[in-house]
């Protein structure tokens, strides 16, 4: 596969004010329940050593983890935002299903593994933190994949 095969999202995904608002409101609701403000999941350490052209693939990994291991277990919380945001993020995940990179993805896997381990170590509060950073996930997908 050539580098960054199909690692692309249409800008129109991010031009729907309603779902943008719902995603950010969900993040706000969860962040109000997050009392561990020193830890940042989607921040400088996640992108360290990863070139911009590979960051869409990185964010695909984070998106899939967030959907499967965070939003699914917490799906009954933070309504009505959750029931609207999950299908939207699932659609983005489906659009990135063919996103792969060729070459060394060691840094990406290491950074994603660190994020996953942090969430797991924090338990339910880690899941709440990840939901509280959905605004960052959204912006990072927009920045990296459009």
């Amino acid at each position: 596969l050539p580098v960054n095969t199909r690692c692309k999202l249409e800008v129109s995904n991010f031009q729907q004010p309603y779902i943008v608002n719902r995603t950010f409101m969900l993040a706000k609701e969860a962040s109000l329940a997050d009392n561990n403000t020193d830890v940042r999941l989607i921040g400088e350490k996640l992108f360290r050593g990863v070139s911009a052209k590979d960051q869409c693939y990185l964010m695909k990994q984070v998106l899939n983890f967030t959907l499967e291991d965070v939003l699914l277990p917490q799906s009954d919380r933070f309504q009505p935002y959750m029931q609207e945001v999950v299908p939207f993020l699932t659609k983005l995940s489906n659009q990135l299903s063919s996103c792969h990179i060729s070459g060394d993805d060691q840094n990406i896997q290491k950074n994603v593994r660190r994020l996953k381990e942090t969430v797991k170590k924090l338990g339910e509060s880690g899941e709440i933190k990840a939901i509280g950073e959905l605004d960052l996930l959204f912006m990072s997908l927009r920045n990296a994949c459009v």
Epitope: V11, F14, P17, V20, N21, F24, M25, A27, K28, S31, T37, D38, R40, G43, E44, L46, F47, R48, V50, S51, A52, K53, Q55, G132, E133, D135, L136, M139, S140, R142, N143, A144, V146
Partner: antibody, heavy 121, light 111 residues
Framework: EVQLVESGGGVVRPGGSLRLSCAAS????????MNWVRQAPGKGLEWVSG????????DYAASVKGRFTISRDNAKNSLYLQMNSLRAEDTALYYC??????????????WGRGTLVTVSS | QAVLTQPSSVSGSPGQSITISCTGA?????????VSWYQQHPGKTPKLIIY???KRPSGVSNRFSGSKSGNTASLTISGLQAEDESDYYC??????????FGGGTKVTVLG
């Protein structure tokens, strides 16, 4: 060492146009989102426009939308701001600014020294 | 255009702690994790001192700290020093993907 050098400022009449440039060096230019921020004499900072690493997303302040266009040429390590239909209130020092870390252009960690734009009849 | 509100001036004596607030509507500071703070000395370019709400760039003194509660972000300067006399600006990404700056706060070190 990260360096950002703006150019293209000058005096222009209301309704006129200018094209600002920002030459970047000391880092991998296409790994970072970039911004233009302005500061009118004696006033505060005002974000003007931002662009992601590949030019796929371009965002503007409401005050310049439809008049200004941001662009970048990664092969030339350069950022641009095309300013049309200029008004007196666009008079300011225009800074080029880079995101502090790759992946977050909104944290502006590196700034140029600015280029002065004066709109006057 | 969204607006972030800062006090126009804050003063303190050397060694004291001061806090600068930055208040926005729920669509600004309150909704997002994107708050940053900048220091600008007269005639100089702005300098990033806090990003991602509470993170400090390398080389920035640990006397500067950031926090956020509800719709208000805060910058605290502890052990105030003469060289801290400067203008300080908060900024945040907002829901139309633009960045909004606060109006700025002039910090004066007394005595």
């Amino acid at each position: 060492e990260v360096q950002l050098v703006e150019s293209g400022g000058g005096v222009v009449r209301p309704g006129g146009s200018l094209r600002l440039s920002c030459a970047a060096s000391g880092f991998t230019f296409d790994d970072y989102g970039m911004n233009w921020v302005r500061q009118a004499p004696g006033k505060g900072l005002e974000w003007v426009s931002g662009v992601n690493w590949n030019g796929g997303t371009r965002d503007y302040a409401a005050s310049v939308k439809g008049r200004f266009t941001i662009s970048r040429d990664n092969a030339k390590n350069s950022l641009y701001l095309q300013m049309n239909s200029l008004r007196a209130e666009d008079t300011a020092l225009y800074y080029c600014a880079r995101g502090w870390y790759s992946g977050a252009a909104w944290n502006m960690g590196y700034w140029g020294r600015g280029t002065l734009v004066t709109v006057s009849s | 255009q969204a607006v972030l509100t800062q006090p126009s001036s804050v003063s303190g004596s050397p060694g004291q702690s001061i806090t600068i607030s930055c208040t926005g509507a729920s669509g600004d500071v309150g909704a997002y994790n994107f708050v940053s703070w900048y220091q600008q000395h007269p005639g100089k370019t702005p300098k990033l001192i806090i990003y991602d709400v509470n993170k400090r760039p390398s080389g920035v003194s640990n006397r500067f700290s950031g926090s956020k509660s509800g719709n208000t972000a805060s910058l605290t300067i502890s052990g105030l020093q003469a060289e801290d006399e400067s203008d300080y600006y908060c900024a945040s990404l907002v829901s139309d993907f633009s960045v909004v700056f606060g109006g700025g706060t002039k910090v004066t070190v007394l005595g």
